[in-house]
């Protein structure tokens, strides 16, 4: 079964950035991926980043930079300045879907004991959508 | 969740009509465009149509002059309207939510399919 592994980071040299890091482990080519912040893409979140692997990248504010690192995983970072500005306890959900076999969605957050610069391991934790 | 359900579609002979539509239900933010792909049987999907944040209309250059499609926001839903139908429109047809990515509309939602099938 396909999964989805969200990181979330703190950089320690700005402690107002985050760097949201997800990826997919599963054989499907992937269509699109979403990157949203305060729940699911479908489910209340604001979407803060859309990369498609061959027209591009979309981006909103807070979002400084999202690109594709491999084929199946991809990295946001967030720039921390006023009332857009991401807290430690924010939920960042990214969602991969392959049209039109399905899509596939796993949310993280900053871990409560983690040290600015020190990175989470990967936590899938899947929410599995059949659509 | 969004929810994306498709009707209308099913058999009919080649110059005929079939009205698809779909209901919406759900939102994901800052998506900015509606339409609908197809997949033929051993073919790569396509999109047929959509309807931009701006209202306006794009389709397919096989599908212009034949197809329409339209929107009702006060009932959350899509339709396409197809005529002069042929053997070459047989597929599922996809009703999706979407990003723009210049003149494409990139999936993020859709719904399971309806068939329709152009035949004799």
């Known amino acids: 079964t396909p999964e989805v592994w969200v990181q979330v980071r703190m950089e320690a040299t700005e402690l107002s950035s985050f760097t949201i890091r997800c990826g997919f482990l599963g054989s499907g080519s992937i269509s699109l991926v979403t990157v949203s912040w305060g729940g699911p893409n479908g489910a209340g979140g604001t979407t803060l980043a859309v990369l498609h692997p061959e027209r591009g990248i979309r981006q909103w504010a807070p979002a400084r930079q999202a690109r594709w690192e491999t084929q199946s995983s991809i990295s946001l970072i967030l720039e921390g300045s006023g009332a857009s500005s991401p807290c430690a306890n924010t939920t960042f959900c990214c969602k991969f879907a392959s049209f039109p076999e399905g899509s596939w969605e796993a949310c993280g957050s900053l871990p409560p004991s983690s040290d600015p610069g020190l990175s989470a391991p990967p936590t899938p934790a899947p929410i599995l959508r059949a659509d | 969740e969004v929810q994306l359900v498709e009707s209308g579609g099913g058999l009919v002979q080649p110059g005929g009509s079939l009205r698809l539509s779909c209901a919406a239900s759900?939102?994901?933010?800052?998506?900015?465009?509606m339409g609908w792909f197809r997949q033929a049987p051993g073919k790569e999907r396509e999109g047929v149509a959509h309807?931009?944040?701006?209202?306006?209309?794009r389709y397919v250059e096989s599908v212009k002059g034949r197809f329409t499609i339209s929107q009702d926001h006060a009932k959350n839903s899509l339709y396409l309207q197809m005529n002069s139908l042929r053997a070459e429109d047989t597929a599922v047809y996809y009703c999706?939510?979407?990003?723009?990515?210049?003149?494409?509309?990139?999936?993020?939602?859709w719904g399971q399919g309806t068939m329709v099938t152009v035949s004799s």
């Open positions: 999706v939510v979407g990003f723009k990515f210049g003149d494409y509309c990139a999936p993020n939602d």
């Open positions: 759900g939102y994901t933010s800052r998506t900015d465009c």
């Open positions: 309807i931009d944040s701006d209202g306006i209309p």
